[in-house]
């Protein structure tokens, strides 16, 4: 049920999970100069019942100075198969995340945690993409990727997000940029393409909220 690969990368975009499906593993990694405690867990595991999901095991790091080594803890070879590295995340959550049944929230940081987190995702996991600072969405089709099982193999769907650093792009004559949300898309998805002032104010707020979801999760 583990996904064989990492989610696809999109040029000039980052992704993150808003919640983690039961079965997801998070490696217990320590920052340089620290190591897992002797009897410590190798990973945290998202587990749960029908009403509540939470992370099993706790990651604990201790100073490795006593062993006269500064070797950083890395996953064992068997752990490396489904690794996904993300930047370190803070415990702040989007408000709706905890209510997703069968999913765990972002685990809070542990003392002396490494600066990157390595997740092992499971089938059904969804991750969301957005353009990095300085880039905007030229085209925002489905901006998420789902790990699916097909013909006995796992595969992440390809997000249809194109991020561009080009500020001046053409638009076809006589056509105004969207004023409302066509085809039921959230308004925030049109924010970086809108030219009308009133709507821009709304969408900038929405875009700010959208961005804050990303920035509060990732330090």
């Amino acid at each position: 049920e583990l996904c064989d690969d990492d989610p696809p990368e999109i040029p000039h975009a980052t992704f993150k999970a808003m919640a983690y499906k039961e079965g997801t593993m998070l490696n217990c990694e320590c920052k340089r100069g620290f190591r897992r405690i002797k009897s410590g867990s190798l990973y945290m595991l998202c587990t749960g019942n029908s009403s509540h999901s939470s992370w099993d095991n706790q990651c604990q790091c201790t100073s490795s100075a006593t062993r006269n080594t500064t070797k950083q803890v890395t996953p064992q070879p068997e752990e490396q198969k489904e690794r996904k590295t993300t930047e370190m995340q803070s415990p702040m959550q989007p408000v709706d995340q905890a209510s997703l049944p069968g999913h765990c929230r972002e685990p809070p940081p542990w003392e002396n945690e490494a600066t990157e987190r390595i997740y092992h995702f499971v089938v059904g996991q969804m991750v969301y993409y957005q353009c990095v600072q300085g880039y905007r969405a030229l085209h925002r089709g489905p901006a998420e990727s789902v790990c699916k099982m097909t013909h006995g193999k796992t595969r992440w769907t390809q997000p249809q997000l194109i991020c561009t650093g080009e500020m001046e792009t053409s638009q076809f004559p006589g056509e105004e940029k969207p004023q409302a949300s066509p085809e039921g898309r959230p308004e925030s998805e049109t924010s970086c393409l809108v030219t009308t002032t009133d709507f821009q104010i709304q969408t900038e707020m929405a875009a700010t909220m959208e961005t804050s979801i990303f920035t509060t999760e990732y330090q």
Epitope: E9, R140, Q158, L161, Q171, P182, L193
Partner: antibody, heavy 115, light 107 residues
Framework: QVQLVQSGAEVKKPGASLKISCKGS????????MHWVRQAPGQGLEWIGV????????IYAQKFQGRATMTVDKSTSTAYLELSSLRSEDTAVYYC????????WGQGTTVTVSS | DIQMTQSPSSLSASVGDRVTITCRAS??????LEWYQQKPGKAPKLLIY???TLAEGVPSRFSGSGSGTDFTLTISSLQPEDFATYYC?????????FGQGTKLEIK
């Protein structure tokens, strides 16, 4: 099933303009950007530009900036490429291709520019 | 603009052979690379995307590898229908440029 169907072959005189179409079916048209690519006889593939089928925003290869115009009509799920001031070097097969990874292509439109 | 250079430009091989085509980018493009197959008079067909992911419906004898600037398309055992021209292309940034193509011919 996913299909991109392009308009028929065109013969044009130098200096004229041309508009070719690419109609998408079998998927949600506005979910995927549309690229335009051309191939001169016996040559390789040349990227012309990409248009967001959702917003109409477009980016062109520098070579085509000002001479090519990509548009979309969401109501008919059709993308268009217009090329003005045609010259003999524009003789080529023009393709539309879907999405980030160009996973589906139109059958191609043969354009001949000749006096 | 990013230049994509394929080698060889043409290649003669026999059915059953293992064939490798390489593509080099003029700068780091991470894994934002596709491989296409084109037969005479037909539109290109996507084989591999994101450097190594096999497109739907493509036989498993095709595989892609590489990251950064150097990429490889491998056909493990050539079939008669594989004789065609192959193109690499990046989608790192606009303009999305293609390699000049590799023509695979029957020996």
């Amino acid at each position: 099933q996913v299909q991109l169907v392009q308009s028929g072959a065109e013969v044009k005189k130098p200096g004229a303009s041309l508009k070719i179409s690419c109609k998408g079916s079998g998927y949600t048209f506005t979910d995927y950007a549309m690229h335009w690519v051309r191939q001169a006889p016996g040559q390789g593939l040349e990227w012309i530009g990409v248009i967001s089928t959702y917003s109409g925003d477009a980016i062109y290869a520098q070579k085509f900036q000002g001479r090519a115009t990509m548009t979309v009509d969401k109501s008919t799920s059709t993308a268009y490429l217009e090329l003005s001031s045609l010259r003999s070097e524009d003789t080529a097969v023009y393709y539309c291709a879907r999405g980030v990874t160009f996973d589906y292509w139109g059958q191609g439109t043969t354009v001949t520019v000749s006096s | 603009d990013i230049q994509m250079t394929q080698s060889p430009s043409s290649l003669s091989a026999s059915v059953g052979d293992r064939v490798t085509i390489t593509c080099r980018a003029s700068q780091d493009i991470s894994n934002y690379l596709e491989w296409y197959q084109q037969k005479p008079g037909k539109a290109p067909k996507l084989l591999i995307y994101n450097a190594k992911t096999l497109a739907e419906g493509v036989p498993s004898r095709f595989s892609g590898s590489g990251s950064g600037t150097d990429f490889t398309l491998t056909i493990s055992s050539l079939q008669p229908e594989d004789f065609a021209t192959y193109y690499c292309q990046h989608h790192y940034d606009t303009p999305y440029t293609f390699g000049q193509g590799t023509k695979l011919e029957i020996k």
